[in-house]
């Protein structure tokens, strides 16, 4: 009762390998690494056959089929390129994930190379079977911002794409009679989060209670250049409005807030985040030059707070920007302490502007980003948010604009955004 000689399948083997097989002998068919046993269209690791009493094998020898990892998973904000010809997805084939540059970059500078493993899964040396993450690039406008050597007196029109993080925040509080409408600025931090000043998102109440406006009353415009033409802009509603829990309306201490957008916005040449600074209590160094952009800065005879409280009628049509130096803290404190009224400049604030005055000292919308270029990382970093100014008209001598010191709130911002700092390290200024 001898069974016929067995031929191992291509890319496979038979064990035990014998010259002759008799009744009740069993054979295990297996395949080389990267191949699977295929029997009746069913894939398996091994297949056993037996020599029967009548001298026949219990089954035909199966075939060995190369492992197929199939089409790789889509990567959000990423692309896939196939290293092997004909876009093969079989064992030892290679693919490369890359992010949609220049707007996204791969977390931890991963190679993005994945190989089809013997187990039939795409594997990366570092991440294993997990897909890489494409994080938004920050602080790198598609258009170069101007050199900061020459001082700009007053505001200038910003070219589209110069301030891709700039957001226009429009609040229409329909719970008020009559309806209240006002606007402010903000800065895009990621595809889903806007940083702004708390006083922009505080309900304009008849008392000093701090209550945020309802998220339903907030609209955010991104990629906006000329307010008369919103067609090219992305507008988004708010999913969450988060005011700093310690925001104090009496002195505007902790004047910082976040808006989570209903849907992540697609990044592009006119919509890109700004970088957050390091956690640093000192804040920006005195005399450093920064830029502020906004739509409310074309009116030289009103203060920032008057702009924000007077509704959209004071909007400048085209986004403006101005260049301002950081003022030493002691000098700013002294200039405000000499005024009547509660003008305390706290450690959570810094000042910017010029001693001699000029309309540039109070340009910019409330909540707008005061950005400084970081030479080390070659990125623009949000160091301040337009917060408040003196009671005098814009351009009064020794009236500096006061900004929320963002570097004091980096931990709070990451916490609200629900991201551990390690995950977003590439976004932090080096």
């Amino acid at each position: 009762n001898e069974c016929p000689e067995l031929q191992p399948p291509v890319h496979g083997k038979i064990e035990p390998s014998q010259a002759k097989y008799f009744f009740k002998d069993q054979v295990l068919v297996s395949c080389d690494t990267g191949y699977k046993v295929l029997k009746d269209n069913v894939e398996m690791d091994t297949f056993q056959i037996e020599c029967l009493k009548d001298g026949t094998w219990s089954n035909k020898i199966p075939t060995c089929k190369i492992v197929d990892c199939r089409a790789p998973g889509e990567l959000e904000h990423g692309l896939i390129t196939f290293s092997t010809r004909n876009n093969l997805t079989t064992y030892k084939s290679e693919i490369k994930y890359s992010c949609q540059e220049p707007y996204y970059k791969m977390l931890n500078n991963n190679t993005g190379i994945y190989t089809c493993s013997a187990q039939g899964v795409w594997m990366n040396k570092v991440l294993g079977r997990s897909l890489p993450t494409c994080l938004p690039e920050c602080g790198q406008p598609s258009r170069s911002l101007p050199s900061l050597v020459k001082r700009i007196i007053g505001g200038r029109n910003a070219e589209p794409g110069l301030f891709p993080w700039q957001a226009l925040i429009v609040v229409e509080d329909t719970s008020r009679v009559p309806n209240d409408k006002w606007f402010g600025s903000g800065a895009l931090l990621s595809a889903s989060w806007i940083l702004t000043a708390a006083h922009v998102l505080r309900s304009q109440r008849r008392d000093t209670t701090v209550i945020p406006v309802s998220k339903e009353h907030v609209t955010v415009y991104l990629g906006l250049h000329d307010v008369r033409d919103k067609s090219g802009a992305v507008n988004s509603s708010a999913a969450r409005v988060v005011l700093h829990p310690d925001f104090n309306i009496q002195n505007y201490n902790h004047d910082i807030a976040l808006v989570q957008l209903q849907e992540p916005v697609p990044l592009g040449p006119h919509v890109m985040p700004v970088c957050l600074p390091r956690l640093e209590p000192e804040g920006p160094a005195p005399h450093m030059l920064g830029l502020v952009a906004g739509w409310g800065i074309s009116n030289p005879n009103v203060t920032v707070d008057e702009i924000i409280s007077s509704g959209t009628r004071t909007l400048s049509d085209v986004l403006q920007y101005v260049k301002l130096p950081v003022v030493p803290h002691a000098e700013c404190k002294t200039s405000y302490e000499s005024r009547s009224g509660n003008y305390s400049v706290t450690e959570n604030m810094f000042c910017a502007g010029y001693y001699e005055g000029g309309k540039d000292t109070c340009l910019g919308d409330s909540g707008g980003a005061f950005v400084i270029f970081d030479d080390l990382s070659q990125r623009w970093v949000v160091q301040g948010l337009v917060s408040w100014g003196g009671p005098e008209e814009c351009g009064s001598k020794q009236v500096y604009g006061v900004y929320t010191k963002v570097s004091n709130y980096v931990d709070w911002v990451w916490e609200q955004m629900g991201l551990p700092q390690s995950v977003v390290e590439p976004q932090v200024e080096r």
Epitope: S175, V177, R205, R206, D207, I211, I249, D305, G341, P391
Partner: antibody, heavy 114, light 112 residues
Framework: QVQLVQSGAEVKKPGASVKVSCKAS????????INWVRQAPGQGLEWIGW????????KYNDKFKDRATLTVDTSSNTAYMELSSLRSEDTAVYYC???????WGQGTLVTVSS | DIVMTQSPDSLAVSLGERATINCKSS????????????LAWYQQKPGQPPKLLIY???TRESGVPDRFSGSGSGTDFTLTISSLQAEDVAVYYC????????FGQGTKVEIK
């Protein structure tokens, strides 16, 4: 339209507690605060406290903070003001107001008498 | 605590004449950041809840006749009824909302 409807008049003995309700309708209850004010017969207005239904934040007049408790039930859009250890000088009309005093309840007379 | 003091306690004015009520606070009600004075005026008629007339010292509430106006800043405020009508007979209260809330003691306005 916005309406604040308060519970009916109460007569209480000294030392007892009273709980006045204020049912809101016609607006989103959680988007604005509720204030409680009282007025003793022939006297002026006296602020008791404030509650914000969205997060249950409260503020009290120091005079009432040990005896008054403000609560809300967002499922029924109702605010409550409980005053304990009642004394005769607590006899007053108690008002709730909302949307920053744009709308007021009709008032609830609480009489404290032995 | 902020103390609010109204004057006079009562006022009799002829129909069509101007009525002026003053309110003084024990500390400034002007917020230097928002640039608003957190002072409101209320009207209360017998058996009715108070009615908000003016907020932020000078902003008239929707639906309030323009004969009612508010003025002042810091610690001194005024409610003016430019031409008194019969339906204006009531008690008027000022209220600060700068730090919690405090009402003035009230001013009774009658027709002379």
């Amino acid at each position: 339209q916005v309406q604040l409807v308060q519970s009916g008049a109460e007569v209480k003995k000294p030392g007892a507690s009273v709980k006045v309700s204020c049912k809101a309708s016609g607006y989103t209850f959680t988007t604005d605060d509720i204030n409680w004010v009282r007025q003793a017969p022939g006297q002026g207005l006296e602020w008791i406290g404030w509650i914000y239904p969205r997060d249950d934040r409260t503020k009290y007049n120091d005079k009432f903070k040990d005896r008054a408790t403000l609560t809300v039930d967002t499922s029924s859009n109702t605010a409550y003001m409980e005053l304990s250890s009642l004394r005769s000088e607590d006899t007053a009309v108690y008002y709730c107001s909302s949307l920053e005093d744009t709308y007021w309840g009709q008032g609830t007379l609480v009489t404290v008498s032995s | 605590d902020i103390v609010m003091t109204q004057s006079p306690d009562s006022l009799a004015v002829s129909l069509g004449e101007r009525a002026t009520i003053n309110c003084k606070s024990s500390q400034s009600l002007l917020n230097s950041r928002t640039r608003k004075n957190y002072l409101a005026w209320y009207q209360q008629k017998p058996g009715q809840p108070p009615k908000l007339l003016i907020y932020w010292a000078s902003t008239r509430e929707s639906g309030v006749p323009d004969r009612f106006s508010g003025s002042g800043s810091g610690t001194d405020f005024t409610l003016t009824i430019s031409s008194l009508q019969a339906e204006d007979v009531a008690v008027y209260y000022c209220k600060q909302s700068y730090n919690l809330y405090t009402f003035g003691q009230g001013t009774k306005v009658e027709i002379k």
